[in-house]
């Protein structure tokens, strides 16, 4: 990895678990300044592997609300608007970081957690797997 | 929202910016116990809207490495294996949370940041927009 010199103005950590426990400013900086939310807002409907979005809420997590994609069909939509079952609609999943309140119900203490979320669906050609 | 009683065993915060600055344990808890990584590992190749994965590295960010999807074609792959330009390959994007070192180069002080990443691609039917 790249070695970066430590900034002398860094806050000190008096936590015995340092560097595992760090200070995090929850004032979110949003880098997505040049994105148009309308762009992909209707892909879930227009895709050949359309999906529905389900709300997953957990007050012990930050962010507390995450939207999960569920593919609408087993197959994919063909040019005639029918479902083709020799293709598969499959969820595209991504591991994301969230903050989990730890100990539970604490407003100012969290632990990083990795969760797998389905972001949308794509259409794939199934392949055969031979079991000996 | 749901009101949760504060746990009396919560650590105290002496930071003047509380509750904006919180303690976070970086010992990641992985919730993805029942997932099989073989599942979606080759969707990028088998999809009708295939994509390539590009490595985005930033040592000032946690996680420092993020993989970005870039659709391979403007169109989608048809049953004959050719690119059909009546359809569009589009990236499925998701806003994710990352930790940005703040002040820069500090090992134990971060700020939450929202970034938009492309997770994969899906095939959509283009829509015609008539300008009056």
């Amino acid at each position: 990895g790249i070695t970066i010199p430590r900034n002398p103005g860094c806050p000190n950590s008096e936590d015995k678990n340092f560097p595992r426990t760090v200070m995090v400013n929850l004032n979110i900086h949003n880098r997505n300044t040049n994105t148009n939310p309308k762009r992909s807002s209707d892909y879930y409907n227009r895709s050949t592997s359309p999906w529905n979005l389900h709300r997953n809420e957990d007050p012990e997590r930050y962010p507390s609300v995450i939207w999960e994609a569920k593919c609408r069909h087993l197959g994919c939509i063909n040019a005639d608007g029918n479902v083709d079952y020799h293709m598969n609609s499959v969820p595209i999943q991504q591991e994301i970081l969230v903050l989990r309140r730890e100990p539970p119900h604490c407003p100012n203490s969290f632990r990083l957690e990795k969760i797998l979320v389905s972001v949308g669906c794509t259409c794939v050609t199934p392949i055969v797997h031979h079991v000996a | 929202g749901i009101t949760i009683p504060r746990n009396p065993g919560c650590p105290n915060s002496e930071d003047k910016n509380f509750p904006r600055t919180v303690m976070v344990n970086l010992n990641i808890h992985n919730r993805n116990t029942n997932t099989n990584p073989k599942r979606s590992s080759d969707y990028y190749n088998r999809s009708t809207s295939p994509w390539n994965l590009h490595r985005n590295e930033d040592p000032e960010r946690y996680p420092s490495v993020i993989w970005e999807a870039k659709c391979r074609h403007l169109g989608c792959i048809n049953a004959d294996g050719n690119v059909d330009y009546h359809m569009n390959s589009v990236p499925i994007q998701q806003e994710i949370l990352v930790l940005r070192r703040e002040p820069p180069h500090c090992p134990n002080s971060f700020r939450l940041e929202k970034i938009l990443v492309s997770v994969g691609c899906t095939c959509v039917t283009p829509i015609v927009h008539h300008v009056a």
Partner: antibody
Framework: EVQLVESGGGLVQPGRSLRLSCAAS????????MHWVRQAPGKGLEWVSG????????GYADSVKGRFTISRDNAKNSLYLQMNSLRAEDTALYYC????????????????WGQGTTVTVSS | EIVLTQSPATLSLSPGERATLSCRAS??????LAWYQQKPGQAPRLLIY???NRATGIPARFSGSGSGTDFTLTISSLEPEDFAVYYC?????????FGQGTKLEIK
């Protein structure tokens, strides 16, 4: 040895319920979609239902939709078929079968079959 | 749903002979057709998938051909264990459907 063993069949009155089970062994169960296929006495084969590796995609034949529920427990290497509101025409030998597709998806061709369990719906 | 019609209903042949079984679809199923063999008291066994691909462990004497609506299963030289009922199955349209079967019996 790759094996599927069905159980839970029996004689049941019309309108009642039955739950079939299928125990899988000899292969990585959660790598594959699974199916139920039935065969009425002296008749041909009829696909009943299918489920992908993580229960995220499920399909049913119109003849059983709303009455039958397919499910799986990957931790137990088991497939299930909950059959409610049974009718005389549901009388058949029920087979559990493994899909040939990789990655737990659907190909709808089946390369491993159990020996079947008999369901008889009669008053 | 797609209807698969198999012919003949019964085929009487002797060991060593060539068997030709036919399956016709009510509409095109491209090459998404499979063949199964079922012996009395046994479960079906996958022989051919995608019209012409032999499944694992299936002897070379079994071959499949065709596309669209007309398909053929050929057994080049019949062995005593080949006498059984054969089913075709399509996976092109919902729901997957089977033909009514062809019984291959010893003459």
């Amino acid at each position: 040895e790759v094996q599927l063993v069905e159980s839970g069949g029996g004689l049941v009155q019309p309108g009642r319920s039955l739950r079939l089970s299928c125990a899988a062994s000899g292969f990585t169960f959660d790598d594959f979609a699974m199916h139920w296929v039935r065969q009425a006495p002296g008749k041909g084969l009829e696909w009943v239902s299918g489920i992908n590796w993580n229960s995220g995609s499920i399909g049913y034949a119109d003849s059983v939709k709303g009455r039958f529920t397919i499910s799986r427990d990957n931790a137990k290497n088991s497939l299930y078929l909950q059959m409610n509101s049974l009718r005389a025409e549901d009388t058949a030998l029920y087979y559990c079968a493994k899909d040939i597709a990789a990655a737990g998806e659907f190909y709808f061709d089946m390369d491993v079959w159990g020996q079947g369990t008999t369901v008889t719906v009669s008053s | 749903e797609i209807v698969l019609t198999q012919s003949p209903a019964t085929l009487s042949l002797s060991p060593g002979e060539r068997a030709t079984l036919s399956c016709r679809a009510s509409q095109s199923v491209s090459s998404y057709l499979a063949w199964y063999q079922q012996k009395p008291g046994q479960a079906p066994r996958l022989l051919i998938y995608d019209a012409s691909n032999r499944a694992t462990g299936i002897p070379a004497r079994f071959s499949g051909s065709g596309s669209g609506t007309d398909f053929t299963l050929t057994i080049s030289s019949l062995e005593p264990e080949d006498f059984a009922v054969y089913y075709c199955q399509q996976r092109s349209n919902w729901p997957p459907t089977f033909g009514q079967g062809t019984k291959l019996e010893i003459k």
